[in-house]
Amino acid sequence: GQNITARIGEPLVLSCKGAPKKPPQQLEWKLNTGRTEAWKVLSPQGGPWDSVARILPNGSLLLPATGIVDEGTFRCRATNRRGKEVKSNYRVRVYQIPGKPEIVDPASELTASVPNKVGTCVSEGSYPAGTLSWHLDGKLLIPDGKETLVKEETRRHPETGLFTLRSELTVIPTQGGTHPTFSCSFSLGLPRRRPLNTAPIQLRVREPGPPEGIQLLVEPEGGIVAPGGTVTLTCAISAQPPPQVHWIKDGAPLPLAPSPVLLLPEVGHEDEGTYSCVATHPSHGPQESPPVSIRVTETGDEGPAEGSVGESGLGTLA
């Protein structure tokens, strides 16, 4: 049999080989498609199937506007002028070229050594589903599950039967200072159909920078707490990957496991003092927060001491 592809919505003509070009003709078309239950027989006389498929005067079969339900097998059996039976057999597939794919929510820049979402490539309205591929500097990017991760999603429109594809790319760039170019392409996987490409996006890769700011948050606000109360100190830092955080009290390191949160339950006067946190980033060394003062006193005795936490709850230096 012969494989035929037709664009959804366009007419398709299948010839009945051996059929005389003009009536009288002895021919029969049989089709087994998404519209039929098993085989449907069409005769040149026409009928209610004319809108879906009709036999032309020369014996060919016309599908005026092919659809997904027309995918299937079409067979014609004709008797030629010499009385010999000739058979034609077609396997029909339909396709729809989607709109140009787009990269949505693209990153503005990437950070070396950490996972970065590059963006999501979206293709809408394809049939068959097809595939999305990512390219780095013009070369096909093969997901390895470690440095290059691709998360894919395919949805089918309930009415049209067309597909929407989404592909989210996450990468871990090895070094900073580079400017990689990413693009995405859609391929239907049909012969003679070129892939559709997105506009490329060029991104700067920066080294994981020193944390932009390190803030020490204290609860209760002001750092004044009644005996037996609880104090929570949180070291807030905007760095990727999250650095190790150690704690200092009155200039001496506290012998605690690294943690961005320091909890002081049932405080007593021995917990009073000046606290700060130190964040250690592998490539940038340690960075210390401004200190905060913790005072244990009966409530209402005194206002915030100099160098303690102000209204905002952020550590401030006197």
Epitope: R7, I8, G9, E10, P11, V13, L14, S15, S51, V52, L56, S60, L62, P64, A65, G67, I68, V69, Q96, G125, Y127, H157, E159, T160, G161, L162
Partner: antibody
Framework: DVQLQESGPDLVKPSQSLSLTCTVT?????????WHWIRQFPGNKLEWMGY???????NYNPSLKSRISITRDTSKNQFFLQLNSVTTEDTATYYC????????WGQGTLVTVSA | DIVLTQSPASLAVSLGQRATISCRAS??????????MHWYQQKPGQPPKLLIY???NLESGVPARFSGSGSGTDFTLNIHPVEEEDAATYYC????????FGGGTKLEIK
């Protein structure tokens, strides 16, 4: 017998959207064929604009793709044309037609784009 | 896009004579099974009317003096014998990869 009838405003201001309706009688637009919009400019040049298939999928003329949308209301057996950001160049007679062979056309409606 | 070039742009033919209109496609509009070329007639104030579909098939109700031929990129519409009512503009149109129309040929009857 199959009949198509275009309707919509005959005057549209530049930069606005042109919206037309094609009402089909004598055949269900979900039963088969593709349903097209075609326009004819004052110099008689014909331009195919796009179609909506009986399944609901659409195809558009690449030159209009960024501005055009064809939709339908199956309960009313109507399909619609929306053309955005029109200019005086979009002044034309707009036809709807049944595709596959274009054996059936509406009578056409003249739309003038003018301030 | 496939571009269709019609020739001549206009022609005048005497009553009863043959009118021949050509349409050339920038790329083949045919397959091994058929040619996706159609011909229309348009009179002032009316929509185009289908005459010939798929290169050579006469639309129902169209007089047999109209005939179409051709394959691949070259197609012809013939009208013979020409009658008074055939004065109109004729267009070719393909449906191979989306759709385009030719520029039209205006037929005058002498």
């Amino acid at each position: 017998d199959v009949q198509l009838q275009e309707s919509g405003p005959d005057l549209v201001k530049p930069s606005q959207s042109l919206s037309l309706t094609c009402t089909v009688t004598g055949y269900s637009i979900t039963s088969g064929y593709s349903w097209h919009w075609i326009r004819q400019f004052p110099g008689n040049k014909l331009e195919w604009m796009g179609y909506i298939h009986y399944s609901g999928s659409t195809n558009y003329n690449p030159s209009l793709k960024s501005r055009i949308s064809i939709t339908r209301d199956t309960s009313k057996n109507q399909f619609f044309l929306q053309l955005n950001s029109v200019t005086t160049e979009d002044t034309a007679t707009y036809y709807c037609a049944r595709g596959g062979d274009f054996a059936y056309w509406g009578q056409g409606t003249l739309v003038t784009v003018s301030a | 896009d496939i571009v269709l070039t019609q020739s001549p742009a206009s022609l005048a033919v005497s009553l009863g004579q043959r009118a021949t209109i050509s349409c050339r496609a920038s790329k083949s509009v045919g397959t091994s099974d058929s040619s996706y070329m159609h011909w229309y007639q348009q009179k002032p104030g009316q929509p185009p009317k289908l005459l010939i579909y798929l290169a050579s098939n006469l639309e129902s109700g169209v007089p047999a003096r109209f005939s179409g031929s051709g394959s691949g990129t070259d197609f012809t519409l013939n009208i013979h014998p020409v009658e008074e009512e055939d004065a109109a503009t004729y267009y070719c149109q393909h449906s191979r990869e989306l759709y385009t129309f030719g520029g039209g040929t205006k037929l005058e009857i002498k």
